[in-house]
């Protein structure tokens, strides 16, 4: 039978660490991490790490009992957890009978939005106390709410990841810019900024009809040339406060009729939050 892995939490040091080993198995040949999605009962889905590792192909694989994987996450707070993956059989061959290196994976470490993770792995038996054993580590940064997978998470949807304000902005005259955008039921307060290297105008927008999606219009006084300036629309939603996903547009000249000119190159940009 071919070896498989059985993984379980192991927060403290491995028992083997306390034992003296004449020789330890070789190091890992490769360690990789990628996010995978799994649906959860609430109708939302969670993002987990798929940690995969490749064993070095030589006779030292015969000593191998387990591989331990530890993950440290750094965002607003620091997290740390480890799993120990035991091999169910002794290795009879240095490579898989079907060809290729022995490769295993563990899916289980949860991934939070926009977090830097440090993933380390080492084989067991590991080095003796006061000795450095072979290990591998990789970094993995989870994406934020603009990611094509993450944007459908409930937390991101509440932060406006699926909202397209379809911003249009045009220069009415030397002193004013008209900004139009589609509101969202997620919130009723918005800030519109006009920037041309510096902020040349801004306005708070309060939209009382929060339950409906309507087209809001605001005329903003400006203190400099506004043609080609950037409009940044910052929403204020309950879940993300002032750090919600921001959207951008560009100021063009208003048509003679005074109707704002629609834009094709609207871009979205996360604020400082990126949940």
């Amino acid at each position: 039978r071919e070896p498989t892995v059985q993984c379980g939490s192991e927060t403290g040091p491995s028992p083997e660490w306390m034992l003296q080993h004449d020789l330890i198995p070789g190091d890992l040949r490769d360690l990789r991490v990628e996010p995978v999605t799994t649906s959860v009962a609430t109708g939302d889905y969670s993002i987990l790490m798929n940690v995969s590792w490749v064993l070095r192909a030589d006779a030292s694989i015969r000593l191998l009992k387990a591989t331990k994987i530890c993950v440290t996450g750094k965002s607003n707070f620091q997290s740390y957890s480890c799993v120990r993956c035991n091999y169910t059989e002794a290795f009879q061959t240095q490579t898989r009978p079907s060809g290729g290196k022995w490769t295993f994976s563990y899916i289980g470490f949860p991934v939070e939005l926009n977090t830097v993770y440090f993933i380390g792995a080492h084989n067991i038996p590991n080095a003796n106390m006061n000795e450095d054993g072979p290990s591998m580590s990789v970094n993995f940064t989870s994406p934020g709410c603009l990611d094509h997978i993450m944007k459908y998470k409930k937390k991101c949807v509440k932060a406006g990841s699926l909202w397209d304000p379809n911003i249009t902005a045009c220069k009415k005259n030397e002193e004013t810019v008209e900004v139009n955008f589609t509101t969202t039921p997620l919130g009723n307060r918005y800030m519109a900024l006009i920037q041309h290297s510096t902020i040349i105008g801004f306005s708070q927008v309060f939209e009382p009809h929060q339950k409906k999606q309507t087209r809001a219009s605001v005329v903003i006084p400006v203190t400099g040339d506004s043609e080609g300036a950037t409009v940044q629309l910052t929403p204020y939603f309950p879940t993300c406060g002032s750090d919600c996903i921001r959207h951008k547009g560009t100021v063009v000249l208003c048509p003679q009729t005074g109707v704002p000119f629609p834009l094709d190159n609207n871009k979205s940009k996360p604020g400082g939050w990126l949940p």
Epitope: S60, Q94, G99
Partner: antibody, heavy 118, light 107 residues
């Protein structure tokens, strides 16, 4: 039945290169590492290196690292060993060898005599 | 690299004799050792692997023992076809090295 059949004897001048082939049959080529071992006349056996046909990972004996190139063609289940900048002391029989478990060599090619002479 | 010291380098024996060849390694190889027999003009033939396991089709008069750094190949009753050169080899991770060989000649 596992078989490793090597290319024929070669006579080369110093400074030239030689490429020896090892055609395999009777097993799944990508499943086992292929090793190369040489034996100078009247001398012992010397391991040169090995290649994993699955992904072409190579591990060399440092002595040969700068002059030997190991390759495979999985479509015809054949391994190759090329030795460059030949010297007279490279005159030897070159063997390919493999095994299904770890690197004890259960299966050997018949050997290829490479003579380096001016 | 692991050094392999094989002894004796040659020996003379008669048919029916018990022959012992030893192989010492420069570090513990945890029984990851193979023995080969080679006849003139032929490729080596695997006799034993993992220090004690017989290769396919190898007669039971061949046996291996040892652990750590000291290993032994024994031919319990030498036969005419056993006159050849014998090599040990470790496979405890590359680079693999062979012993210098023991030539078994007819007395």
């Amino acid at each position: 039945e596992v078989q490793l059949v090597q290319s024929g004897a070669e006579v080369k001048k110093p400074g030239a290169s030689v490429k020896v082939s090892c055609k395999t049959s009777g097993y799944t080529f990508i499943s086992y590492w292929m090793n190369w071992v040489r034996q100078a006349p009247g001398q012992g056996l010397e391991w040169m290196g090995r290649i994993d046909p699955y992904d072409s990972e190579i591990q060399y004996n440092q002595k040969f690292k700068d002059r030997v190139t190991l390759t495979v063609d999985t479509s015809i289940s054949t391994a190759y060993m090329e030795l460059s900048r030949l010297r007279s002391d490279d005159t030897a029989v070159y063997y390919c060898a493999t095994s299904g478990g770890f690197d004890w060599f259960a299966y050997w090619g018949q050997g290829t005599l490479v003579t380096v002479s001016s | 690299d692991i050094q392999m010291t094989q002894s004796p380098s040659s020996l003379s024996a008669s048919v029916g004799d018990r022959v012992t060849i030893t192989c010492r390694t420069s570090e513990n190889i945890y029984s990851n050792l193979a023995w080969y027999q080679q006849k003139p003009g032929k490729a080596p033939k695997l006799l034993l692997y993992d220090a004690t396991n017989l290769g396919d089709g190898v007669p039971s008069r061949f046996s291996g023992s040892g652990s750590g750094t000291d290993y032994t190949l024994t031919i319990s009753s030498l036969q005419p076809e056993d006159f050849a050169t014998y090599y040990c080899q470790h496979f405890w991770g590359p680079p693999y090295t062979f012993g210098g060989g023991t030539k078994v000649e007819i007395k």
